[in-house]
Structure formats: C-alpha cells, structure tokens
C-alpha cells in the first residue's frame, strides 16, 4: 500500500460493566473492538468499510488500559494499510463488543453484543504526529489517538510519490522527506543516472561512464581531453583541431618535418663557406675561394685562385704554391715590373701611364678588359649580380639576369606584384606577402579576397586564418581575430619570422 | 565546407604510369598550396609532393624525384599527381592536404584518399 491509518487504543472505561441495550455482562464485559473506515461521509451510514477494517482480540474486562504491542495478536496501534492517494478526509467507526466466546478470535463468537460506539468523520493531513481523542457516552469513556503515514517508499501529502532508493544502472540517489530524489555524490540528471566528470573534462570532446573519470573522443588526448591530437606522422607542428599539422617556427612541408632553418641548426657548410637557407635540400652553401664541393669540404689546388699576376706561372706546393714570372715581372705573385711603358706592356689596346718618373706604369684597360696589363677579359658574373636565385648569363660586352618565376627586374630584383591583377573585391585593399596576396577588407565584407558580403556576425565566415579564435566585437560588422603562435596581423595572415627562399614556402 | 577529392587509383603493373587528381572546393584555390602525402599498411604517411599556391615552387620527396610530378590547374580547381615507373614499394593509400595556406607548411584539410597498388 502506499500509505497507513494508524489507530492507539489507550483506554477504555465502562465502570457498570453494561451493554449498549442496558443489559449488564456476566461476570464482566470481556471487551474487544471494531473499527471500520472509510471516505469522509457528513452522515455515516452502514455499508462497506472503503478505506479497510480491523477486529481486535478481548483486550480487558469493563474498564482497561490498552499497552502497546508491536506483534502477535491484540497488536495496537492497530494498523489499516491503504493503496491509493490519501484523500485527507475519513469517516471512521469504533465499536466496543463484549463477547462470551474465544479471547483470541471473539468475531467468530454466536452471541457477541455491542457495549458502545463511537463515529469520527473530519480531516486529517499525513504526519508523524498522533492526534489525541477522547469520547464519552453515559456509560463508557473510549481514549485513543490516530494519525496517517506513508509507507516504505512513498512520499508526499498524499503519499502518491513512490521512491525507491536505488545505485545502479538506472540511478545513483536516495529519497528527500518529499520524494524528490538526492542524487548520491557524482551523480546528476534527473534520475540521477548522469555520472559527474572529472572536474575540468573538456564538455565537447571528453565524457565518462562513471563519476570523476574523463574519456576522450576520437582526436583528443590529456588529462581532461582538452588537447588535440595532430595528423600521425607531423613531426615538429601542432594542431587547434584534430589531425591537423600546424608547422612551428622553422619547419616545412605537409609533414612539417622540412628544417627551414637548416644552416642554423645542422651547420653543413664547412671551411667558412657561407650558409643559405635555400636550394632543393633546404640549404646552399657558397664557398670560399679554394674550396669546392656541395658542403666546401674539398680544397682546390692552390693555384685554382689564379694568384699569379701578369701572365706568371703557378706551380703548386705542399702547403702553398710559386709564381714563376715572366720576363719583366717579380714578386710573390709578379706584381712588382721591371717595365714601362715604351716596353708596350698593355695588352688589348690598355692605354699606358708612366709612374714614379718613368721607372713603372699603370694601364687604363678598355671595356671588358682588367688585370694589370688588361690582360684579362672580365666575367661580369663573378660578383653574383642577379638576386633572389636569377641565373647569371654573360652576352657578349654585357650580362643579363635569368630570373626565377614571381621575380622581374635587371637583377631579379624585384617581386612581381600579386596585387597587380587587382583581387581584393568590394574595395579591398591588397598587401603583396610571400605567401601570396591578402586583402585587407572593408567594413562590411570578409574573406580572402573580400567576396563575402556581412550580414549579421561578422565571425560567421571565419575571416580569422591558421586556426585564429574570432570574436565579435562592438558593433555587428566588427572582429577581433585571437591569434596562435606563430601568427600575426588583424586577421591573424602573417607567419612571424617565415624564412622566405625555402622550397616549401610559397 | 572544404572538399579535397580523390580520383585516378587503380592497380598497375611496376614500371607502369597513374595519374592522380585532386579536385577542390570550399575555399578560394589559389590561395592555398595542395600537396599529396601516402601511407602503405602499418606505415607513417610520408609527405611526397607539394605545390605552392602560385604554382612556382614544388617539393619531391628523394623517392620519388624524378619519377613522380605535380601540377595545378587553377582554372578547373585541380592539382594533379602524375607518377611514372611505378615500384610496387610506391603502393600505399594516397591523401591530398592543403595547409590552408600558400606555403607547404603543415596539413589543415584531408580527402578520403584513393588507392594505388604497383603489382605483377
């Protein structure tokens, strides 16, 4: 049942020892009770007991205290258990029979006869409180008290709310005094079935099937699976997203495992060459005059410098080499001559110049002649003219610069202008970077190239690039783009620091 | 949303010839590199080719230079894979990426991939 009327007899007093018909019990009135209930009724009538009915054994003769007793039979308070919403209101019928018959079962007696009754119809709301009565007739006093209570697992003014606790699949709680549940500690939703996470579980990408435990989905990692796993195989990036590879400072390529800034870390280049970040390898190195090789590991012969001058001969040595001169010349490397000028010295029409009175000369060489003695037709490549990687070619009395794609100018000088095919829509302005265009967009438009028109969140077309947070700002139209590391710029386009002639950087 | 697409796998004989394409949509092409990365069973993907945006610059990995080339057509939003005297050490699974950038540093958008086997 979901709830139970409960009735004490305390005491009962019929001093005469007389029936209800004026009659007078022999020896004495062996008294035993009645009780009917039943729905609030203004006039009580016979008819079925609604609410449950009780008998008890012969608890005294004539006048008795009742005790209390919690088992067996003559139990009191006696106990009428119901299964249904407690209406509040009752109609309840106490009679007193004496009996001649069995102590224990006197409702089976022949003979039984009624001593008195009593009738109580009113309210009566569910608690632990007894209410106390007490009724009086010409002839006997009848004390008792009563009240209603809900049982085992039923809660409520009406004990209508069933609630079992339970720790299982189903629920982790125990009952509040009104039936509403209180989860157990770790345990939330309304059943309490929704185990609480660790504290600080990333909401999205972690979850759990008990309390204090976090369990990542698929792409995150760490503690609380807030940490997102990179694609497999990058080597020195990282990711804003799952199976993203975000290459750090320095590094290339889709895996990020090319060093841009190779020199720096692996110094290849040997003998005191100098050392670029650049070439197919991701570095080249120019050497130092008597050295060769793709690292300058290989020393030349030491006459490869050429040190003779004025058509000396070198022959090499162990650790050196030895300018054999020509008629006229001497020193280390034939510097010093012994000529001058009416010895006709200048060679591919040089013009002669006396010095020092006559005693040496100096020739003024024409185009494309030098040396001393203009004896040498000059390689106007040697100075390495021609930037950003153009190729050096000699024509003729002239050198042109053979430019590499993206470079224009009469030593690739110059950077051919992305901006010069005008991409940037709706007023855009464009800013020429080396990893191409970017535009710089007007109120009211984003996107690359500006061709995105704002309606409302100016964040909902992601004008925020390399995993940049966006956030909107004070007016609907407006941005703040949040950047990683690495990247700078309103819209976060600008790589910090990105070495510009590597293979993998466009 | 970005879309890298796939095509052109198949089986081939060693020595023999594929092309692949990568077809692209979402994002405005040529502002990123694309590149093509593989991966053969219980092995790491290995980045094997990448071009730049402006198409200038291109990356071979040393197992496959001079064998494999790449190549984009901006106009029909495609990069091509072309791989010649195939090996059967070049069958793998073959993903196009993009950076998401103009450079071809690191990997931001994936395709399913498409399937090479070099087999006699």
């Known amino acids: 049942g979901s709830g139970i009327f409960q009735l004490r007899l305390q005491e009962f007093v019929n001093q005469r020892g007389m029936l209800a018909n004026g009659q007078s019990c022999e020896p004495g009135c062996r008294t035993f009770f009645r009780i009917c209930l039943k729905h609030f009724q203004a006039t009580f009538s016979e008819g079925p007991c609604t609410f449950g009915n009780v008998s008890t054994p012969v608890l005294g003769t004539n006048s008795f205290v009742v005790r209390d007793k919690n088992s067996g039979s003559g139990r009191n308070p006696l106990q009428l258990p119901f299964n249904f919403t407690w209406p509040g209101t009752f109609s309840l019928n106490i009679q007193a029979w004496h009996t001649p018959g069995d102590d224990l079962r006197p409702e089976t007696s022949p003979g039984n006869s009624l001593i008195s009754q009593i009738i109580i119809q009113g309210s009566l709301a569910v608690g632990k409180i007894w209410r106390t009565d007490e009724q009086n007739d010409t002839l006997t006093r009848l004390s008792y008290s009563y009240r209603v209570i809900c049982s085992d697992n039923y809660y409520g003014e009406s004990c209508s709310r069933l609630c079992k606790k339970r720790d299982d699949h189903f629920g982790h709680y125990e009952c509040q005094p009104d039936g509403s549940l209180s989860c157990l500690p770790g345990w939330t939703g309304k059943y309490c079935d929704q185990p609480i996470c660790l504290s600080g579980c990333h909401e999205q990408n972690g979850y759990c099937s008990k309390p204090d435990e976090c369990i990542c989905r698929p792409g995150w990692q760490g503690r609380l699976c807030n940490e997102c796993i990179p694609h497999n195989g990058c080597r020195h990036g990282t990711c804003s997203i799952p199976w993203q590879c975000a290459c750090d400072e320095g590094w290339g390529g889709l895996f990020c495992d090319q060093d841009l800034n190779y020199c720096t870390h692996h110094s290849p280049c040997k003998n005191g060459s100098t050392c670029s970040n650049s070439g197919p390898k991701g570095y080249t190195c120019t050497c130092l005059p008597g050295y060769t090789g793709e690292h300058c590991e290989l020393g030349l012969s030491k006459c490869a410098s050429n040190p003779c001058r004025n058509g000396g001969s070198c022959k090499d040595q162990e650790n050196s080499y030895h300018c054999l001169c020509p008629p006229g010349y001497y020193g280390q490397h034939c510097e010093h001559s012994t000529l001058t000028c009416a010895d006709s010295p200048c060679f591919n029409g040089g013009s002669c110049r006396e010095r020092n009175q006559g005693s040496s000369y100096a020739c003024e060489c024409p185009p494309n002649f030098t040396g001393s003695n203009c004896e040498k037709k000059v390689d106007r490549c040697t100075s390495n003219p021609c930037a950003n990687g153009g190729q050096c070619q000699n024509r003729g009395p002239s050198r042109t610069c053979r430019c590499r794609p993206g470079f224009t100018g009469t030593h690739c000088e110059l950077h051919i202008s992305d901006c010069a095919r005008s991409p940037c829509a709706h007023g855009g302005t464009c800013h020429d970077l080396e990893n191409g265009p970017v535009c710089t967009c007007p109120a009211g438009f984003s996107g690359r190239r500006c061709e995105v028109r704002i309606t409302h969140d100016a964040c909902a077309s992601g004008p925020c690039f390399n995993g940049a947070t966006c956030y909107t700002g004070l007016s609907p139209n407006n941005f703040v783009c949040n950047c990683p590391y690495g990247f700078v710029g309103s819209r976060c386009e600008f790589p910090v620091g990105l070495p510009p002639s590597f293979p993998w950087v466009a | 949303e970005v879309q890298l697409v796939e095509s052109g796998g198949g089986l081939v004989q060693p020595g023999g010839s594929l092309r692949l394409s990568c077809a692209a949509s979402?994002?405005?092409?040529?502002?990123?590199?694309i590149g093509w990365f593989r991966q053969a069973p219980g092995k790491e993907p290995e980045g094997i080719s990448c071009i730049s945006s402006s198409g200038g610059i291109t990356y071979y990995a040393d197992s496959v230079k001079g064998r494999f080339t790449i190549s984009r057509d901006n106009a029909k939003n495609t990069v091509y894979l072309q791989m010649n005297s195939l090996k059967p050490e070049d069958t793998a699974v073959y993903y196009c990426?993009?950076?998401?950038?103009?450079?071809?540093?690191?990997?931001?958008?994936t395709g399913q991939g498409t399937q090479v086997t070099v087999s006699s």
């Open positions: 990426a993009t950076p998401g950038i103009a450079a071809c540093r690191g990997i931001h958008y």
């Open positions: 979402g994002f405005t092409f040529d502002d990123y590199a």
